[in-house]
Interface confidence: medium
């Protein structure tokens, strides 16, 4: 029997989007150019749901993870790597005391129960983001049957 | 100890400005994350958000009063203004100042001040 | 805007009881959301955010449950220090309250 899976192997699907977490380490650059490979981008956090999600992921794995968040272009002002702006609802993501710029840190990551800024030249695990397919009769995405990755609850 | 204070006049007049400054102590505004508040409640009624400033000057006003209101801050002094133009008896409430931690915890708020009664009238 | 509705508006209870008030978001706020109690003259008090996570020094009969854009604040037995009108707020798109719950002695 023929199953939709509106995500590719091994990645996570949740509210539309399909999610790969990395198994290696790259510095924020090169985590870029990682997701653009594979037809996706460095994660673009676009509501509170999907932050708790990929924080929940991040903190279970206990993993310090790159998202496509930076204040390269002008300290201070943080914008994603779609160029849209932070949000101002979305500060309350970060640690306390974050974020500091300590020694040019300019590119977010996960980092326990919320964000921090750190030095992008570092290299850390990374999530990528695409939507998923929509599973049409003629997608690709119909595949052999595939582990079902469960949403987690919310945080 | 952390503590917000309200100051500023018991009365008004219709059509006034009114100002009104909290004076905090035990944290800073300029620790990222941290931000005050002006929240307001007319007698008997329901609590009302009307302005935030955060660490970094970031100001946000409520939609339906953000022409008449002003926020700012004097880090150096622990102070954070609020002016509100053009007074009308609606506006009678008790103001109050509130702080939001920093923290991954979201932005709600920790610690009040006691609130000042503002009363508008001719 | 985003829209907080508590329900009831009023709540008569006895010492004792376990009592429980609604907060409904008129759009997802995730878990977003803190519970405050206030007395007569007094400002309010934080009790939960982050939708069940219960503020340093309140009561462990105090708790919070839901996400998305239905929550409950509960008092798993109320004492007679409870009695006081509580708010519900979310903070997921700027700052907004509920009309509040007066609970009162019944």
């Known amino acids: 029997e023929r199953l939709c899976h509106p995500c590719p192997w091994e990645w996570t699907f949740f509210q539309g989007n399909c999610y790969f977490m990395s198994n290696s380490q790259r510095n924020w650059h090169d985590s870029i150019t990682a997701c653009k490979e594979v037809g996706a981008q460095l994660v673009v956090i676009k509501s509170a749901e999907e932050q708790n999600f990929l924080q929940l992921q991040s903190s279970r794995s206990n993993r310090f993870t790159w998202m496509g968040l930076s204040d390269l272009n002008q300290e201070g002002t943080w914008q994603w790597v779609d160029g849209s702006p932070l949000l101002p609802s979305f500060k309350q993501y970060w640690n306390r005391g974050e974020p500091n710029n300590v020694g040019e840190e300019d590119c977010a990551e996960f980092s326990g129960n919320g964000w921090n800024d750190d030095k992008c030249n570092l290299a850390k695990f990374w999530i990528c983001k695409k939507s998923a397919a929509s599973c049409s009769r003629d997608e690709e995405q119909f595949l052999s049957p595939a582990p079902a990755t469960p949403n987690p609850p919310p945080a | 100890q952390v503590t917000l204070r309200e100051s500023g006049p018991a009365l008004v007049k219709p059509t006034q400005t009114l100002t009104l400054t909290c004076t905090f102590s035990g944290f800073s505004l300029s620790t990222s994350g941290v931000s005050v508040s002006w929240i307001r409640q007319p007698p008997g009624k329901a609590l009302e958000w009307l302005a935030l400033?955060?660490?970094?000057?970031?100001?946000y006003y409520s939609t339906s009063l953000k022409t008449r209101l002003t926020i700012s801050k004097d880090t150096s002094k622990n102070q954070v203004v609020l002016t509100m133009t053009n007074m009308d008896p609606v506006d009678t409430a008790t103001y109050y100042c509130a702080r939001t931690p920093s923290g991954s915890y979201g932005r709600y708020f920790d610690l009040w001040g006691r609130g000042t009664l503002v009363t508008v009238s001719s | 805007d985003i829209q907080m509705t508590q329900s009831p508006s009023t709540l008569s209870a006895s010492v004792g009881d376990r009592v429980t008030i609604t907060c409904r978001a008129s759009?997802?706020?995730?878990?977003?959301l803190a519970w405050y109690q206030q007395k007569p003259g007094k400002a309010p008090k934080l009790l939960i955010y982050k939708a069940s996570s219960l503020e340093s020094g309140v009561p462990s009969r105090f708790s919070g449950s839901g996400s998305g854009t239905e929550f409950t604040l509960t008092i798993s037995s109320l004492q007679p220090d409870d009695f006081a009108t509580y708010y519900c707020q979310q903070y997921n798109s700027y700052w907004t309250f509920g009309q509040g719950t007066k609970v009162e002695i019944k």
């Open positions: 400033i955060d660490w970094d000057d970031d100001k």
């Open positions: 759009q997802s706020i995730s878990n977003w």
